[in-house]
Amino acid sequence: IVGGTNSSWGEWPWQVSLQVKLTAQRHLCGGSLIGHQWVLTAAHCFDGLPLQDVWRIYSGILNLSDITKDTPFSQIKEIIIHQNYKVSEGNHDIALIKLQAPLNYTEFQKPICLPSKGDTSTIYTNCWVTGWGFSKEKGEIQNILQKVNIPLVTNEECQKRYQDYKITQRMVCAGYKEGGKDACKGDSGGPLVCKHNGMWRLVGITSWGEGCARREQPGVYTKVAEYMDWILEKTQSSDGKAQMQSPA
């Protein structure tokens, strides 16, 4: 996160850290807890690393430096990448992770509510992006979970800024015209959440941007509302019943 500040314990209890353990262990992506056994993240996090066994999912944590060999983590039972995601393009950057064992909810580890299907009418004015990603383009992973308040940008405006790419209706953009605040490398897959009528909702999944926090280069996020049918289909077919935090 560029231009952010430290988060507090329990402030973003749905935020998870997706880490890979090969020879060393490192944080690669963020994710959002959406049910006892489900995490929503970006498909591109698994490019070149599709093996379930190498991943460790840490929930209910604030500081990555607090993680030791004794820190509990979740393992992956199944990675479900959107069927239309292609490595050669930036569309449908969404994936579900089914955990091997369900998580208990606590003050520091609980799910984020999902938006209504095709939610286009709600005007979100209080949106935040969180993650342990770089604090500048040529930076490094941060220890303490960062947060930043960023306004949404219309798709029309976003398309003007990204003429080389197709900004689809299944994407949502956020950023300041002057730059300075944005997601960055390592924040991929994490949440863009907006508070509406007193409730936090998962509006976007951190996907991509041209550099980080550059002027007139908003961040681009997968629009969760556009994938509600897919999310429900995959979680229900796997569970027999939905275990999601549906919107109030």
Epitope: D164, D187, W208, C212
Partner: antibody
Framework: EVQLLESGGGLVQPGGSLRLSCAAS????????MTWVRQAPGKGLEWVSY????????IYADSVKGRFTISRDNSKNTLYLQMNSLRAEDTAVYYC??????????????????WGQGTLVTVSS | DIQMTQSPGTLSLSPGERATLSCRTS???????LAWYQQTPGQAPRLLIY???SRATGIPDRFSGTGYGTDFTLTISRLEPEDYGTYYC?????????FGQGTRVEIK
């Protein structure tokens, strides 16, 4: 299966014009940047031009700027290269290529993942 | 413009040998925008490596790419008969997009 098929090459006199076409199939053409690359006989590859998915943004190599025009018709899944004021040094095999723009670590990538078979343009009197 | 300088110009090696091809750039190139292509006579180029180190679909694991900034390398761990040809590095970090002049890998 992704396919790119160039056509329109041939022999043309210096100062003449030619229009190359590239018919695309097997993918959502309107989502991709497209590019032209050329290769003079016995020489290396030279990038010529690219066009954005909508067609609203185009960039050219200095060697062809003001003479060549790249365009596309997304309804026909076709890429074009209009070549005017041709010179002997424009003699080359012209390839159209798809520009993949995937996502790696929250940034986009760019690389030419699919190529046509090429069409030969010969500029000679 | 970003100049791409490949070395050596020609590499004469026997099957089974290791090939190391270098690509140096005149300015910093974001690794995401560095690719390697193979071309055999009479054929269109074929993508081998993108993002400096990711193998394209269907490319055998004897091909690997490394590098950062201005110094990139393509390695073929054990040359196979079908690997002979010309290899090009290319950047699309800044326009104009540019190719190296190529390294020809020939049978010794």
């Amino acid at each position: 299966e992704v396919q790119l098929l160039e056509s329109g090459g041939g022999l043309v006199q210096p100062g003449g014009s030619l229009r190359l076409s590239c018919a695309a199939s097997g993918f959502t053409f309107s989502h991709y940047l497209m590019t032209w690359v050329r290769q003079a006989p016995g020489k290396g590859l030279e990038w010529v031009s690219y066009i954005s998915p909508s067609g609203g943004h185009t960039i050219y190599a200095d060697s062809v700027k003001g003479r060549f025009t790249i365009s596309r018709d997304n309804s026909k899944n076709t890429l074009y290269l209009q070549m005017n004021s041709l010179r002997a040094e424009d003699t080359a095999v012209y390839y159209c290529a798809r520009v993949a723009t995937g996502i790696v670590a929250r940034s986009r990538t760019r690389y030419f993942d699919q190529w046509g078979q090429g069409t030969l343009v010969t500029v000679s009197s | 413009d970003i100049q791409m300088t490949q070395s050596p110009g020609t590499l004469s090696l026997s099957p089974g040998e290791r090939a190391t091809l270098s690509c140096r750039t005149s300015q910093f190139v974001n690794s995401n925008y560095l690719a390697w292509y193979q071309q055999t006579p009479g054929q269109a180029p074929r993508l081998l490596i993108y993002g400096a180190s990711s193998r394209a679909t269907g490319i055998p694991d004897r091909f690997s790419g490394t590098g950062y900034g201005t110094d990139f390398t393509l390695t073929i761990s054990r040359l196979e008969p079908e690997d002979y040809g010309t290899y090009y590095c290319q950047q699309s970090s800044r326009t104009p997009w540019t190719f190296g002049q190529g390294t020809r890998v020939e049978i010794k």
